[in-house]
């Protein structure tokens, strides 16, 4: 799976969309999870309604919401009041039994609020040394991760 980058501004809401084949994943609940380390597990953040027929109902876990358009085949995740610590690698998943198929890998980047004059030095931009000039941007907030880019900060 390629990784798609979604950029949001600190303090604002970020909407992440994950398209999928609605027939292939018919009847399956969906989930949003956060990747813990490059090869670590993906920790569930929020999942759609326990009843698949009610997947269109928005479910919240803290500041993260999920809703599924099962006919159109689009899973939407909203990260409200985006914070620097929200930056990182996530996955949209399709659940069947105890298994999860990856629908999309997502890298969330948090940009400093231009109106916020506090020190932005603690904001982390994964792969910030890379040039993104030629990167593809979807809806002005997302792009595909360039080959060779590292989705996690280097560990000491």
């Amino acid at each position: 799976h390629n990784t798609t980058v979604f950029q949001g501004v600190a303090g604002q809401s970020l909407q992440v969309s994950c398209p999928y084949d609605s027939m292939k994943h018919w009847g399956r609940r969906k989930a949003w999870c956060r990747q813990l380390g490059e090869k670590g597990p993906c920790q569930r953040v929020v999942s759609t309604h326990n009843l698949w027929l009610l997947s269109f109902l928005r479910r919240w876990n803290g500041s993260t919401a999920i809703t599924d358009d099962t006919l159109g085949g689009t899973l939407t995740i909203t990260l409200r009041n985006l914070q620097p610590h929200d930056a990182g690698l996530y996955q949209c998943q399709s659940l069947h039994g105890s298994e999860a198929d990856t629908l999309r890998k997502v890298l969330v980047e948090v940009l400093a609020d231009p109106l916020d004059h506090r020190d932005a030095g603690d904001l982390w931009f994964p792969g910030e040394s890379e040039s993104f000039e030629d990167a593809h941007v979807e809806h002005s907030i997302s792009r595909s991760l360039l080959e060779g880019e590292i989705p996690f900060p280097p560990t000491s």
Epitope: M23, K24, R28, R29, L51, W52, G97, S98, E99
Partner: antibody, heavy 123, light 107 residues
């Protein structure tokens, strides 16, 4: 009416190749996963693998990975199971089965089965 | 892989009897379990899915129960056409695995 019609019985020699088929009708073939299940003589059922004909996404049981190839041709609503080099131990009845996801619990079960293809491998 | 163990491996019963077949999973599988009936020379037929939901057209004398690791299939009043082999199957994870089967014979 949903139907899965499998190709006829085969008698082969060890080392030969073989491709058996399963043709789906009465439903949208590209919209359901389709599995292959082995039943050796007098024995139980073994799940070999599964394919989504819409995009040919395939999963194999570790026991069968590298031993068989599962494929599909959506233009003729047909799935295939093939061997490049048969062994006597491949002698069995092979079933294809449609996998249907039930939204009650978001998992899938085999609701329609083909009649089976008997493969005999003997020198 | 998840191992599925059925008991008994065979059972003799008479028409009208109540029969219970059990299936145990080597690890918890929630309610992701199916029961199939197979007659000699025929393909299996789905009876029960999601541990307790009856497939369309399956007589009400067939019922399933259980969750986690222990499951049962009950036939409340055996009919002549019920003599067959029954398999459980977990739908929790890949690879899907079946029990070894329970042969239901006429006493």
């Amino acid at each position: 009416e949903v139907q899965l019609v499998q190709s006829g019985a085969e008698v082969k020699k060890p080392g030969e190749s073989l491709k058996i088929s399963c043709k789906g009708s009465g439903y949208s073939f590209t919209s359901y996963w389709l599995a292959w299940v082995r039943q050796m003589p007098g024995k139980g059922l073994e799940w070999m693998g599964i394919i989504y004909p819409g995009d040919s996404d395939t999963r194999y049981s570790p026991s069968f990975q590298g031993q068989v190839t599962i494929s599909a041709d959506k233009s003729i609503s047909t799935a295939y199971l093939q061997w490049s080099s048969l062994k006597a131990s491949d002698t069995a009845m092979y079933f294809c089965a449609r996998s249907r996801t039930f939204y009650y619990d978001s998992s899938d079960y085999f609701d329609y089965w083909g009649q089976g293809t008997l493969v005999t491998v003997s020198s | 892989d998840i191992q599925m163990t059925q008991s008994p491996s065979s059972v003799s019963a008479s028409v009208g009897d109540r029969v219970t077949i059990t299936c145990r999973a080597s690890q918890g599988i929630s309610s992701w379990l199916a029961w199939y009936q197979q007659k000699p020379g025929k393909a299996p037929k789905l009876l029960i899915y999601a541990a307790s939901s009856r497939q369309n057209g399956v007589p009400s004398r067939f019922s399933g129960s259980g969750s986690g690791t222990d499951f049962t299939l009950t036939i409340s009043s055996l009919q002549p056409e019920d003599f067959a082999t029954y398999f459980c199957q977990q739908a929790d994870s890949y690879p899907r695995t079946f029990g070894q089967g329970t042969k239901l014979e006429i006493k």
